[in-house]
Interface confidence: low
């Protein structure tokens, strides 16, 4: 809920539909990157406000007679990460009336993403010739996951996943070995996670 103790009056949902809020180049970036938050209204608006939910005033205003407002966050720091929402309003709505807030956009500013876990499904000990599934699980959605095998320089498999995990299938004959994984943002500027702890797959 973005309605704080002062100054924001949000009308019922039927009044003015919520805008869309997105981030360029990404919602996960390293410190020092310039981030643009774009708030797009479903109709031309007069003023846009960018909020961190729960704060009593907007972080930024933009007065633009169009459907799109851009908020520039220069050389972001980890402290600027967190939840953001935007609203818009038109002068004919009367002061104090804003649209419904956009869905929350989570901005993460970090040097390194949290270490993922790597587990074998159903377990790390498999029957000879049986396929095995490895799950690399991070904490963020829409990431690219990479599986490594010890002794092999190149990544073994890639997966892009909308979920905070990715599953890799190992064919039975080649399954035994030592594996690790990591994940990263799907586009530049890339933010990488730490590597997972290693997982040893062996035959019964």
């Amino acid at each position: 809920d973005i309605t704080p103790s002062v100054a924001i009056i949000v009308p019922p949902a039927s009044y003015h539909p919520k805008p869309w809020l997105g981030a360029q180049p990404a919602t996960v970036v390293t410190p020092g990157v310039n981030v643009t938050l774009r708030c797009r209204a479903p109709q031309p608006a007069w003023r846009f406000g960018l909020f961190k939910p729960g704060e009593i005033a907007p972080l930024l205003f933009r007065d633009v007679s169009s459907e799109l407002a851009e908020f520039f966050l220069e050389e972001v720091t980890p402290a600027q990460g967190g939840s953001y929402r935007c609203c818009y309003r038109r002068p004919d709505w009367g002061p104090g009336v804003w649209s419904q807030p956009s869905d929350v956009l989570e901005l993460l500013v970090t040097e390194e993403l949290p270490r993922p876990s790597l587990v074998a499904l159903p377990g790390p000990v498999v029957g000879p010739g049986a396929n095995v599934s490895l799950r690399c699980a991070g904490r963020l959605r829409n990431m690219s996951f990479v599986l490594y095998r010890e002794g092999v320089a190149a990544p073994l498999q890639y997966r892009h996943s909308a979920q905070p995990w990715a599953d890799f299938t190992l064919l039975g004959a080649r399954a035994p070995g030592t594996y690790s994984c990591y994940y990263h943002t799907p586009s530049a500027p890339y933010v990488l996670s730490q590597r997972s702890e290693v997982l040893v797959i062996s035959w019964e």
Epitope: V6, A7, I8, I9, R47, G49, A57, P58, L59, L60, F61, R62, D63, V64, R89, P91, G94, P95, G96, V97, W98
Partner: antibody, heavy 118, light 108 residues
Amino acid sequence: EVQLLESGGGLVQPGGSLRLSCAASGFTFSDYYWTWVRQAPGKGLEWVSGSPVFGAANYAQNFQGRFTISRDNSKNTLYLQMNSLRAEDTAVYYCAKAGFTGGHFDIWGQGTLVTVSS
Amino acid sequence: QSVLTQPPSASGTPGQRVTISCSGSSSNIGNNYVSWYQQLPGTAPKLLIYGNSNRPSGVPNRFSGSKSGTSASLAISGLRSEDEADYYCQSYDSSSWLFGGGTKLTVL
């Protein structure tokens, strides 16, 4: 601490000019609508002019052409240039910050007295 | 002559409930929000109510605001001697901010 401090008031002759300043501290000056409100001795509050975050300033009809509002975001300061002053402009002039909706004034300065007299 | 009309004076005894009215038109109060300010003698106005009925933090819940049609009202319950002040309503009309003429509240 959030503070507004007006200055520049004083005694001026009819037809003269005066420039009022309002120095703000404690929040991001550039993010807000700023306004001047005046109060003649023993009278009520009267809105004078406002400076939006972007776009043209707006004025109450009585002041259009004689008064000019401006702001310097780098100095966190709001100004009111008053020309062709009349005796009826004698008042305490308050600078105030609008709540972000622009619909109300949530922080006020202590006011500066302008006296127009010969 | 103010566009928003308030009674010039109101009074009450300690502990009483007092209501101050503010009358406008469809172009201001009727279509916009109303705020209320308290001005103690010799001081700057202070925001009491915004958006018709919302209290900023720090304002006691003895103060309440409401709006109906083209009129608004400020109610003060449990009246105290320190409530003796001038009270102003404020709204918005076609890019201008409008104030009522003010009501002087006397605590008897």
